[in-house]
């Protein structure tokens, strides 16, 4: 059984800090361990991952790590599975948020002597305590004109006056740590001497060497001052311009004009308004230089007539965002019709052959123009130049079947033979123009052939029947050397095929006629009783009208088939003695004898001193050893036939005679004693 040595336990954890849920397992076989969170398998990430059997957290996350963890151990071989106790985190965290206006509903409604309530959107666990600041100075609870409610995280000003104007921020702390507001609130209670925004500058994008204008206006009593600064805090005035802003002009109404803009002029411009009282107001606007990148290439497209297709033009990156349009034959495409532009797409509805050609996507902005062509081909259904014809092909020669078609794009041609796809191999070859070549025609190639020519627009097909004109040939060719058994009945077959059924006849090679006991029956030479005189050379002649004749020569030998006069017997020999395995065979031609021992032929020239094969065929083995035991086969063969017979040889230890046994006691089994 699977046993947990260490189980995960619930624990406190700090947001963003390390943690470890331990799990250790003991099992009889190898197990693999995985973790569940609320019943679903935990996927490894860089933040949370398996470390051995335990689950390691590089940075605890209060959202992703809330829930119940469980360690599961599985023996993959047996399928046994065990589950640990559940464990969860009590995650301590604090998270910054903005200071927002709670009352009144909008800044426009803030008037002197109204109540203003701000809320600090810092949250955490455990609940933090809050501290408020105005312009960085802490506000203590119970001070005149304001109250702090820690529970609601609110600061209330009653009544609010110009003296409360300022930047309000808050901080909060808990056992976990501290956080301050991510966005602060500027309270501006109307004071005529404070500068107020009338017109704020906007971001501008211009082409190189063009001009750019920023507008900026403030109002106050008495009138406020206005100053322009560039990124590096250099003031811009009509009297003192920085070196890279020689062509800058500040107008009396506060507008800033830049002429012949260069890349070094791009950046952030700040307009600062200062009233008699109150803080300065800083407004920012950015000057961007227009740019446009190159467009990606299009792949050529092949469409079919009658279909609807779209080609998307991805606009190049640029500032400002480039506008995109399509052209064909130098004419801009409309936004409706059969071939039109929709968004960045070229749309071709109910495609016609005439729609083929080059379409151009254009993109342009202040920085310039880019273009990219796409070549559109409209596929057509193939048409016939030459269909395959019913054909007569000669056996053994190459044969050709045409399948010539034309279309756009170039059609692909495949061939079928008896409804089976022909794959190119050593016998079949499909040329580029679609013609099929059969390299060496065989009889069974006579069947139906079908070619199919296809483009994306469709396909056409045609079939033709092939008739094979057979060669005049022997089927099979007679064996050139054959044996017949003396004094027995024998037959020698000869058959042939051709375009017309051939006639077959036998004759002796010397032209002499066949004896009366030898008959020629439809190509089979029949010997009623073989005599020595029947040996010799014979010719089989096959002929028909259109193809002439062919001849096959056969040499017939008359033989007395092999019989064994003496066969080897099952033999048991004492170790160290001599074994004799006798074998004698007769036949005509006189048979030769070979021995096979333990599955290998015994070569008389390599037998060594212990073994010898006599002239009469017997095998003798001297000083026999246990490893000589096994089956021995006597093989008798001549030019006409072969026969074999076998017997086992057993080599045994010589028994030690017991007291009771006399010297003349016979051995317990048949022995050769030497």
């Amino acid at each position: 059984a699977i046993v947990f040595i260490k189980q995960p336990s619930s624990q406190d954890a700090l947001q963003g800090r390390r943690a470890l849920l331990r799990c250790e397992v003991e099992a009889p076989g190898p197990v693999h361990v995985y973790w569940l969170l609320d019943g679903a398998p935990v996927q490894d990430t860089e933040r949370r991952f398996a470390q051995g059997s335990s689950l390691s957290f590089a940075a605890v996350d209060r959202l992703q790590d809330s829930g119940t963890f469980q360690c599961v151990a599985r023996d993959d071989v047996t399928g046994e599975e065990a589950r640990s106790a559940n464990a969860s985190f009590n995650i301590k965290w604090i998270e910054a948020g903005p200071v927002v206006l709670k009352h009144p509903a909008s800044e426009a409604e803030i008037q002197p002597q109204t109540q203003v309530t701000l809320r600090c959107h810092i949250d955490g666990h455990p609940r933090p305590t809050y501290q408020w600041f105005r312009d960085g100075t802490p506000l203590s609870d119970g001070q005149s004109n304001h109250t702090v409610s820690s529970k609601e995280r609110n600061l209330t000003l009653r009544p609010a006056g110009p003296e409360h104007s300022g930047l309000y921020s808050c901080c909060a702390h808990s056992a976990f740590g501290q956080a301050c507001s991510s966005q602060n609130f500027t309270l501006s209670i109307a004071d005529e001497s404070f500068a107020r925004v009338v017109l704020a500058p906007q971001d501008v994008v211009v082409a190189r060497y063009e001009e750019a204008m920023f507008h900026c206006q403030f109002s106050a009593q008495p009138p406020p001052s206005l100053q322009w600064l560039f990124e590096d805090e250099t003031p811009i005035t009509n009297r003192s311009r920085p070196p890279h802003l020689r062509r800058a002009t500040v107008f009396a109404n506060g507008s800033l004009l830049l002429t012949q803009v260069r890349p070094r002029n791009a950046g952030i411009y700040r307009c600062i308004g200062q009233g008699q009282r109150g803080p300065p107001i800083i407004l920012e606007a950015t000057l961007h230089l227009a740019e446009i990148e190159d467009m990606p290439l299009f792949e050529p497209r092949v469409f079919t007539a009658g279909s609807e297709e779209r080609v998307t033009c991805l606009p190049p990156k640029g500032l400002p965002e480039p506008s995109v349009w399509w052209e064909h034959a130098g004419v801009r495409l409309p936004t409706h019709g059969r071939v039109y532009q929709k968004g960045h797409e070229l749309v071709l509805a109910n495609i016609a052959e005439s729609d083929a050609g080059v379409y151009t996507c254009h993109a342009a902005n202040l920085a310039g123009q880019r273009r990219q062509d796409v070549n559109i081909t409209v596929a057509t259904v193939p048409s016939w130049l030459k269909k395959p014809q019913d054909s007569q092909l000669e056996e053994g020669k190459p044969g050709y079947l045409d399948c010539l078609t034309q279309a756009t794009p170039k059609p692909t041609v495949v061939w079928y033979r008896n409804q089976m796809l022909i794959s190119e191999d050593s016998r079949f070859e499909v040329f580029k123009n679609g013609t099929l070549r059969i390299n060496s025609v065989e009889v069974y190639d006579g069947t139906w052939y079908r070619c199919m020519s296809s483009t994306p627009a469709g396909s056409i097909e045609a079939q033709a029947r092939v008739q094979v004109l057979e060669k005049l040939k022997f089927t099979p060719p007679p064996q050139p050397q054959q044996c017949m058994e003396f004094d027995k009945e024998a037959t020698v077959p000869c058959s042939a095929t051709g375009r017309e059924k051939p006639t077959i006849k036998w004759e002796r090679a010397d032209g002499s006629s066949l004896p009366e006991w030898v008959t020629d029956n439809a190509g089979t030479l029949h010997f009623a009783r073989v005599t020595r005189d029947d040996a010799g050379n014979y010719t089989c002649i096959a002929s028909n009208g259109p193809q002439g004749q062919i001849r096959a020569h056969v040499q017939l030998t008359v033989a007395v088939f092999i019989t064994f006069k003496v066969e080897p017997e099952r033999t048991t020999v004492y170790q160290g003695h001599t074994a004799l395995l006798q074998c004698e065979a007769q036949g005509d031609p006189k048979p030769l004898i070979q021995w096979k021992g333990k599955d290998r032929i015994l070569d008389p020239t390599k037998l060594g001193p212990r073994m010898h094969i006599f002239q009469n065929g017997s095998l003798v083995i001297h000083d026999v050893a246990p490893e000589d035991s096994g089956r021995y086969t006597c093989i008798a063969g001549n030019s006409c036939n072969i026969k074999h017979t076998e017997a086992p040889l057993y080599v045994v230890d010589k028994p030690v005679p017991e007291e009771s046994e006399g010297p003349g006691s016979p051995p317990p089994y048949k022995m050769i004693q030497t």
């Epitope: 693999h32 019943g39 398998p41 993959d76 047996t78 399928g79 046994e80 599975e81 589950r83």
Partner: antibody, heavy 112, light 110 residues
């Protein structure tokens, strides 16, 4: 003796449903994971899904929605419910405990 | 979708040959080692040969061995025996209790 026996296979029409059973003996299902694996005629093995020791199920992407694995621990039996069957669902369906112990399989034929 | 690719799909060899079958996964298996090899003969259920990449299952001859890590694995038969002609499958286990088989390698007599 620990063994698994599948049953419930047979001929079903396309669009039809079938429920296969895998009855376990010699051990309790509640401590083991059980897999269903299928093999179309002349084709390779294809994992269908798994039910773990708690009864949670997980499936191959192609099996989600049509196939449902469940179990009845009192009967020590795991089930494979197959809906909207297609011709390509024709196969021998095996149940297996872990990697080692497999049933003999049951043939499902989907044909009209 | 996880794809496991075995190569070769078919393999002809002779008794005594050393045979290597490879298995490649489109993503890493769980723990980099959750991979098993099976042998299947016609009409029979698969038989487990190797689990956890390299551990020999009970009763499996030592001529079978496995190796690899992550997404690439091999099964080696050191000296092929007549009983080894069969189809072999790899099976990977993945994060999220998902498993997948290779398409199989048919080992036939040369």
């Amino acid at each position: 003796e620990v063994q698994l026996v599948e049953s419930g296979g047979g001929l079903v029409q396309p669009g039809g449903s079938l429920r296969l059973s895998c009855t376990a003996s010699g051990f309790s299902l509640s401590n083991y994971v059980m897999n269903w694996v299928r093999q179309a005629p002349g084709k390779g093995l294809e994992w269908v899904g798994i039910i773990d020791s708690s009864g949670s199920t997980y499936y191959a992407s192609w099996a989600k929605g049509r196939f449902t694995i469940s179990r009845d621990t009192s009967k020590n039996t795991v089930y494979l419910q197959m809906n909207s069957l297609r011709a390509e669902d024709t196969a021998v369906y095996f149940c297996a405990r872990g990697l080692y112990l497999w049933g003999q399989g049951t043939l499902v034929t989907v044909s009209s | 979708e996880i794809v496991m690719t075995q190569s070769p799909s078919t393999l002809s060899a002779s008794v005594g040959d050393r045979v290597i079958i490879t298995c490649q996964s489109s993503q890493s298996v769980y723990n980099n080692n959750l991979l098993a090899w099976y042998q299947q003969k016609p009409g029979k259920a698969p038989k487990l040969l190797i689990y956890h990449t390299s551990n020999l299952a009970s009763g499996v001859p030592s001529r079978f061995s496995g190796s690899g890590s992550g997404a690439e694995f091999t099964l080696t038969i050191s000296s092929l025996q007549p009983d080894d002609f069969a189809t072999y499958y790899c099976q990977g286990g993945y994060n999220g209790n998902i498993y997948a088989f290779g398409q199989g390698t048919k080992l036939t007599v040369l």
